[in-house]
Interface confidence: low
């Protein structure tokens, strides 16, 4: 499938609109600090060049790789050294090292201002005045803040964003129509970004084999009627798509994703009965729909797994002949029978099975050695079941905010060296597992909860990797992808931690807290809670609850006062003194 000009090939496959959007996303994900206008200029130059190659594939430079073309273009940015420091050194390298260098400098937590949502009238005016610029800005702002966002999926978000403005800017009550849609897109966008970040971490930190194992398990749960060979083909294609997107090859990724969606829809009879509606949709919606499609029903009368994987005299022979294929078949067979298990649990079971065969197939009596392997699965299955049961009970008792607070305290005691904003962000997200998953029946709770927790803990891992401060976090993040959650769950209070010096400034609040949204006010209070635990890691739940209740009462009182600022100053001093006394600071 060699093309004389790769850039012409992708331009023709994707069309001008998608080509330009994907190049803008790629550039914004690499150079996250560059102004919008600079990126638009670069994208327009690349697009004009691509058009010359479409006209004549033999034209000068049209035979260059996309990495070469894009890298050369990025390296023309005049302020590269001043804005990005050592990233400018990437430009001295040759491909493929230059692209690898750019990838290593992607920043998961770029120092960018929080996106402030203007009033609806202002947004609608901007949308009507220049729709193209308005939508490009959306792509740019999301891409630079989420440098691993799944690019073809971002095109789908942009399409929905455009549809929301098209509909709502004509509505009688523009705000009532638009704001809920924008909130939904924001929340879904954050979730999509975090899920993709885990896929990229899986590929980049643990390799293709780890990603393929994840994909076998997930696709086998989703398509339990599909043959193993069919699942294997889908896994290979899906791995290629995500490897490309995670590697910054966004044009190839989007093109291959479209091909995969086409293949799935052409072969849905041998894949899943749930794909019909998805396959009737336009391309971007189709791909999104397939990615989110519900699990198909399990085939009736599936035989016992033990026959092929424990009782058969050929287990070691089959394993020795093609280890990964045999383990893949085990994972496929187990996963299709267990939509009620999380993917990470299925992978733990497969790992246990692999370890057992490695040991037993070298033993004097292999069958005797591995005969009880399925018994080893029981505690692995029960551990997440019990954890989810306990935490859902706690969530139902406390509600989301207080459940988040319980997790904040728990995680701050485990890893107090982690920065307060990271602890707050991660614990708030961990706490959302309650409202997301505890409402589900038993059969759906574990895949919902544990696979969601994997996504959130990956956020902790990538943020911590940027500025490592805790050996315990590094250990849990790097030792095993599938055991991250059990590793963090098993951490006790860090007894080696030296409590933070008390700083009254940390607990000084002002009247501006009164004008914050409920969510922002919660974050302020949760930030204070983390700081309290860092000062007094041995504080009991009861002590912390008393201080937080006092704090909530203090905020409520001063926000109702006529002279708010004076109230915050005077009552704040009293609160700090009372808290110090209550916690023995």
């Amino acid at each position: 499938d060699a093309h004389k000009s790769e850039v012409a090939h992708r331009f023709k496959d994707l069309g001008e609109e998608n080509f330009k959007a994907l190049v803008l996303i790629a550039f914004a994900q690499y150079l996250q600090q560059c102004p919008f206008e600079d990126h638009v200029k670069l994208v327009n130059e690349v697009t004009e060049f691509a058009k010359t190659c479409v006209a004549d594939e033999s034209a000068e430079n049209c035979d260059k790789s996309l990495h070469t073309l894009f890298g050369d273009k990025l390296c023309t940015v005049a302020t590269l050294r001043e804005t990005y420091g050592e990233m400018a050194d990437c430009c001295a390298k040759q491909e493929p090292e230059r692209n690898e260098c750019f990838l290593q400098h992607k920043d998961d937590n770029p120092n960018l201002p929080r996106l402030v949502r203007p009033e609806v009238d202002v947004m609608c005016t901007a949308f009507h005045d220049n729709e193209e610029t308005f939508l490009k800005k959306y792509l740019y702002e999301i891409a630079r803040r989420h440098p691993y966002f799944y690019a073809p999926e971002l095109l789908f978000f942009a399409k929905r964003y455009k549809a929301a403005f098209t509909e709502c800017c004509q509505a009688a009550d523009k705000a009532a129509c638009l704001l809920p849609k924008l909130d939904e897109l924001r929340d879904e966008g954050k979730a999509s970004s975090a899920k993709q970040r885990l896929k990229c971490a899986s590929l980049q930190k643990f390799g293709e084999r780890a990603f393929k194992a994840w994909a076998v398990a997930r696709l086998s749960q989703r398509f339990p009627k599909a043959e193993f060979a069919e699942v294997s083909k889908l896994v290979t294609d899906l791995t290629k798509v995500h490897t490309e997107c995670c590697h910054g090859d966004l044009l190839e990724c989007a093109d291959d994703r479209a091909d995969l969606a086409k293949y799935i829809c052409e072969n849905q009879d041998s894949i899943s009965s749930k794909l019909k509606e998805c396959c009737e949709k336009p391309l971007l919606e189709k791909s999104h729909c397939i990615a989110e499609v519900e699990n198909d029903e399990m085939p009736a009368d599936l035989p016992s797994l033990a026959a092929d994987f424990v009782e058969s005299k050929d287990v070691c022979k089959n394993y020795a002949e093609a280890k990964d294929v045999f383990l893949g078949m085990f994972l496929y067979e187990y996963a299709r029978r267990h939509p009620d298990y999380s993917v990470v649990l299925l992978l733990r079971l497969a790992k246990t099975y692999e370890t057992t065969l490695e040991k037993c197939c070298a033993a004097a009596d292999p069958h005797e050695c591995y005969a009880k392997v399925f018994d080893e699965f029981k505690p692995l299955v029960e551990e997440p079941q019990n954890l989810i049961k306990q935490n859902c009970e706690l969530f139902e008792q406390l509600g989301e905010y207080k459940f988040q607070n319980a997790l904040l305290v728990r995680y701050t005691k485990k890893v107090p060296q982690v920065s307060t904003p990271t602890l707050v962000e991660v614990s708030r997200n961990l706490g959302k597992v309650g409202s997301k998953c505890c409402k589900h029946p038993e059969a759906k709770r574990m895949p919902c909860a544990e696979d969601y927790l994997s996504v959130v803990l990956n956020q902790l891992c990538v943020l911590h990797e940027k500025t490592p401060v805790s050996d315990r976090v590094t250990k849990c993040c790097t030792e095993s992808l599938v055991n991250r959650r059990p590793c963090f769950s098993a951490l006790e209070v860090d007894e080696t931690y030296v409590p933070k010096e008390f700083n009254a400034e940390t607990f000084t609040f002002h009247a501006d807290i009164c004008t914050l949204s409920e969510k922002e006010r919660q974050i302020k209070k949760q930030t204070a809670l983390v700081e309290l635990v860092k000062h007094k890691p041995k504080a009991t739940k009861e002590q912390l609850k008393a201080v937080m209740d006092d704090f909530a009462a203090f905020v409520e009182k001063c926000c109702k006062a006529d002279d708010k600022e004076t109230c915050f100053a005077e009552e704040g001093k009293k609160l700090v003194a009372a808290s110090q006394a209550a916690l023995g600071l």
Partner: nanobody, 117 residues
């Protein structure tokens, strides 16, 4: 840190003109819509005018339409409000804000505009 520094206010007679400026720093000015908000004594804040990031869209309160003009210079990180045909009811502290919030975005003190004969 976001900084917004308003200037250009003062005492002016009814029918007179003033030009307010707002110097912005600490964020990428050219990427945000901006607004002018005013607060008269014993009254809540009122959005006077807003402008999109690339100046393509502007909005005015009914009370100032035809008299006030909002503009911006992204190269200079500055927002402007040209106020003509001023009336006593325009007397207020004027703030600039990011987006079109009526809550001041930075620690700016605002600039006092007094219209009186």
């Amino acid at each position: 840190q976001v900084q917004l520094v308003e200037s250009g206010g003062g005492l002016v007679q009814p029918g007179g003109s003033l030009r307010l400026s707002c110097a912005a720093s600490g964020f990428t000015f050219g990427q945000f819509g901006m607004s002018w908000v005013r607060q008269a004594p014993a009254k809540g804040p009122e959005r006077v005018s807003a402008i999109s990031s690339d100046s393509s869209g502007t909005i005015y309160a009914d009370s100032v339409k035809g008299r006030f003009t909002i503009s911006r210079d992204n190269a200079k990180n500055t927002l402007y409000l040209q106020m003509n045909s001023l009336k006593p009811e325009d007397t207020a502290v004027y703030y600039c804000t990011i987006g079109s919030s009526t809550t001041p975005s930075g620690p700016g003190q605002g600039t006092q505009v007094t219209v009186s004969s």
